[in-house]
Amino acid sequence: MAVTACQGLGFVVSLIGIAGIIAATCMDQWSTQDLYNNPVTAVFNYQGLWRSCVRESSGFTECRGYFTLLGLPAMLQAVRALMIVGIVLGAIGLLVSIFALKCIRIGSMEDSAKANMTLTSGIMFIVSGLCAIAGVSVFANMLVTNFWMSTANMYTGMGGMVQTVQTRYTFGAALFVGWVAGGLTLIGGVMMCIACRGLAPEETNYKAVSYHASGHSVAYKPGGFKASTGFGSNTKNKKIYDGGARTEDEVQSYPSKHDYV
């Protein structure tokens, strides 16, 4: 029962985490204009992985996609890649874990197969979560670096009375969504790995065998722990854990004139 609960909870937590990673990847607010010196602004800039936007004081919002691929910073490309890898691994993990759920019966699938699938999905969730956390952290580091660089030269002289005020960017909501989502996916993956141990068969994988001892006959079947018998390889009363040697096959705008907000 505890195993089923751990597996089910791991699945749900991972599902929420992956949904969060997808949401974070799609969100426009990865970085938002720093309003420290000017809390009320006529033009509010914010940027995502795929487009950058402006919310005007008039209430209109306009976004512009990054239509170039080669012209984008390598770090941004890396963050995109990490987030997409995280989503893909997470999605595959979810697919595998659905079939691995103890509460779902699919044909005559053995517990050992479910255990292996649970472990596989758990590892995928862990890697997916790590990818998301890494992606968000790389972007955050990039922001911090740029923030202090733009603070150092906040005003770039243009001669005479003309000056260019650089827009400084700070952490956007998507970063926090990404960190939390990555963490949840990671936790879900760990829970799946833990559940895998409880799902593994407790003795060897052979069928029931009759042993004829002198004087009496006892049949041992794979199942609960047996005290006092010295038969089989499980002599020390430990659960047999097949460390996942048999893995399953892995199935691998521009907006109209105005968007009113």
Partner: antibody, heavy 118, light 113 residues
Framework: QVQLVQSGAEVKKPGASVKVSCKAS????????VNWVRQAPGQGLEWIGM????????RLNQQFKDKATLTRDTSTSTVYMELSSLRSEDTAVYYC???????????WGQGTLVTVSS | DIVMTQSPDSLAVSLGERATINCLSS????????????LTWYQQKPGQPPKLLIY???TRDSGVPDRFTGSGSGVDFTLTISSVQAEDVAVYYC?????????FGQGTKLEIK
């Protein structure tokens, strides 16, 4: 069609207050900010502030923070600007204008002349 | 506050000729998020309220004749009237829509020679 109709001309004594109204029609009143701009005789344009009709949110030019109070009445689709402690230099034509994309003012009222004279 | 400086203060051109009005901002009006310049041009005829001509530095408002063209980016902007008509006699203002308080240029008076 979009229209902003302002109240009539006012003559006030120094130290008095005046409340200028701007009635909007022909568009969804609560969706657009309304600006107030003043123009002294023979002078240029000066932005006073703006109010959002769906809430009490305002943006005021600091120069006018002790001078102008912006309010609205959604039931009548009207915005108001009250000017207090009037002085002779407050004599001007006061315009209301709708805020459009690009923070541009696309529709303007006909203007209200406020004369401050003793 | 952003200071908007227009030049010249007044301009006299013959009918059918080109008129150019410049507007210099004390600070860049370019928004990084959408790469648009928050600069607006208005036309004001005597006894009338101003009329919106161009927003986002180069986008003509609906109903504005195509002889009016806005250009420029960052701090330097230009309003060009390709072929001046008699009805274009007015005062032209540029406006900063980038940051509060919104500020206007002092105006440029266009007259017919």
């Amino acid at each position: 069609q979009v229209q902003l109709v302002q109240s009539g001309a006012e003559v006030k004594k120094p130290g008095a207050s005046v409340k200028v109204s701007c009635k909007a029609s022909g568009y969804s009143f609560t969706n657009y900010w309304v600006n107030w701009v003043r123009q002294a005789p023979g002078q240029g344009l000066e932005w006073i502030g703006m109010v959002h009709p769906s809430g009490s949110e305002t943006r005021l030019n600091q120069q006018f923070k002790d001078k102008a109070t912006l309010t609205r009445d959604t039931s009548t689709s009207t915005v108001y600007m009250e000017l207090s402690s009037l002085r002779s230099e407050d004599t001007a034509v006061y315009y209301c204008a709708r805020v459009w994309s690009g923070n541009a003012f696309d529709y303007w009222g006909q203007g209200t002349l406020v004369t401050v004279s003793s | 506050d952003i200071v908007m400086t227009q030049s010249p203060d007044s301009l006299a051109v013959s009918l059918g000729e080109r008129a150019t009005i410049n507007c210099l901002s004390s600070q860049s009006l370019l928004a990084s998020g959408n790469q648009r310049n928050y600069l607006t041009w208005y036309q004001q005829k005597p006894g009338q309220p101003p009329k919106l001509l161009i927003y986002w530095a180069s986008t003509r408002d609906s109903g504005v004749p195509d002889r009016f063209t806005g250009s420029g980016s960052g701090v330097d902007f230009t309003l060009t009237i390709s072929s001046v008509q008699a009805e274009d006699v007015a005062v032209y203002y540029c406006q900063n829509g980038f940051s509060f308080p919104f500020t206007f240029g002092q105006g440029t008076k266009l007259e017919i020679k």
